[in-house]
């Protein structure tokens, strides 16, 4: 089996208030089975940004169709950026487990920061 890698190509993403930000994440393998989630920050206080399998995230859309059985692109778009959205975003692969899924591998993170205001 090819070992799964989480690829977040941008270390830094400069965004503009009011605009939409795209956070990229691809995986190199579909296995082990389990969902991909997005978080801001690390540790027990990290904030869930998007959960592939459940939940309502009105400002978040996926770049690709996650219902494709061979999908390896878990990039997301966050709309209507505000200063409160700055931080480091991680895409995280979980492997299935009972009763809870188990964190398997995290991407290196993308820091979202505010760029210059539009003129």
């Amino acid at each position: 089996e090819e070992e799964l890698q989480m690829i977040q190509p941008e270390k830094l993403l400069l965004v503009t208030v009011g605009k939409t930000a795209t956070l990229h994440c691809t995986v190199t393998s579909l296995l082990p089975v389990g969902p991909v989630l997005w978080f801001r920050g690390v540790g027990p206080g990290r904030e869930l940004i998007y959960n592939q399998k459940e939940g309502h995230f009105p400002r978040v859309t996926t770049v690709s169709d996650l219902t494709k059985r061979n999908n390896m692109d878990f990039s997301i778009r966050i709309s209507s950026i505000t200063p409160a959205d700055v931080g480091t975003y991680y895409c995280v692969k979980f492997r299935k487990g009972s009763p809870e899924n188990v964190e398997f591998k995290s991407g290196p993170g993308t820091e979202m920061a505010l760029g210059a205001k539009p003129s």
Epitope: E1, L30, L31, P32, V33, P35, Q52, K53, E54, D65, L66, T67, K68, R69, N70, K96, S98, P99
Partner: antibody
Framework: DVQLVDSGGGVVRPGESLRLSCAAS????????MSWVRQAPGKGLEWLAG????????YYIDSVKGRFTISRDNSKNSLYLQMNSLTAEDTAVYYC???????????WGLGTLVTVSS | ALTQPASVSANPGETVKITCSGG??????YGWYQQKSPGSAPVTVI????KRPSDIPSRFSGSASGSAATLTITGVRVEDEAVYFC???????????FGAGTTLTVL
């Protein structure tokens, strides 16, 4: 409430074609992958085909690849199964099913009976 | 191929376990589907190994470990008489498969 209503079944002769439909309501159809599953008389369930939410990706079991085509029209909240070159072995109740995020099934249609007989 | 027993029986109130083997834990998710009569619409009682839809009674539970999944009915009732099919999705092949079905008889 989620509702899936299968239709289009009937009696056909070997070699003929049939198009099944599944009308969906009670959920955002365009957000879900869908599948067709059949059950031959006295037999178990057999998955036939699946389609992604956007309709661009399709998947088939080997025994129907090239004969059956799954498609969808998200503007009509409808799923289809075009079945060509039918044989007696295709006689079954055909169900549409909504897929979960990991391609299992959470809701099923009531089924439509297809009989292939000379 | 998924393997499950052809039949199981129990008295009302007993606990019933139906096993399904043949999948690879690393690449497989399991579901369980109840069919009360041939040709009637299946009802999903468990998906994603252990997730119970909100309209399914709590006496139904699921688990998976190694190459097998288990459906447990705790305090079985007469209305639970049905054929139970295990199903699996294999992330390696992108294919869904089903077991042959287990007939549950409540004595």
């Amino acid at each position: 409430d989620v509702q899936l209503v299968d239709s289009g079944g009937g009696v056909v002769r070997p070699g003929e074609s049939l198009r099944l439909s599944c009308a969906a309501s009670g959920f955002t159809f365009s957000s879900y992958a869908m599948s067709w599953v059949r059950q031959a008389p006295g037999k178990g369930l057999e998955w036939l085909a699946g389609i992604s939410a956007g309709g661009s990706d399709t998947y088939y079991i080997d025994s129907v690849k090239g004969r059956f085509t799954i498609s969808r029209d998200n503007s009509k909240n409808s799923l289809y199964l075009q079945m060509n070159s039918l044989t007696a072995e295709d006689t079954a109740v055909y169900y549409c099913a909504r897929e979960t995020w990991n391609h299992l099934f959470d809701y099923w249609g009531l089924g439509t009976l297809v009989t292939v007989s000379s | 191929a998924l393997t499950q027993p052809a039949s199981v029986s129990a008295n009302p109130g007993e606990t019933v376990k139906i096993t399904c083997s043949g999948g690879d834990y690393y690449s497989t998710y399991y579901g369980w589907y109840q069919q009360k009569s041939p040709g009637s619409a299946p009802v999903t009682v468990i998906h994603s190994d252990d997730k119970r839809p909100s309209d399914i009674p709590s006496r139904f539970s699921g688990s998976a470990s190694g190459s097998a999944a288990t459906l447990t009915i705790t305090g079985v009732r007469v209305e639970d008489e049905a054929v139970y099919f295990c199903g699996a999705y294999d992330g390696r092949t992108y294919i869904n498969t089903f077991g042959a079905g287990t007939t549950l008889t409540v004595l």
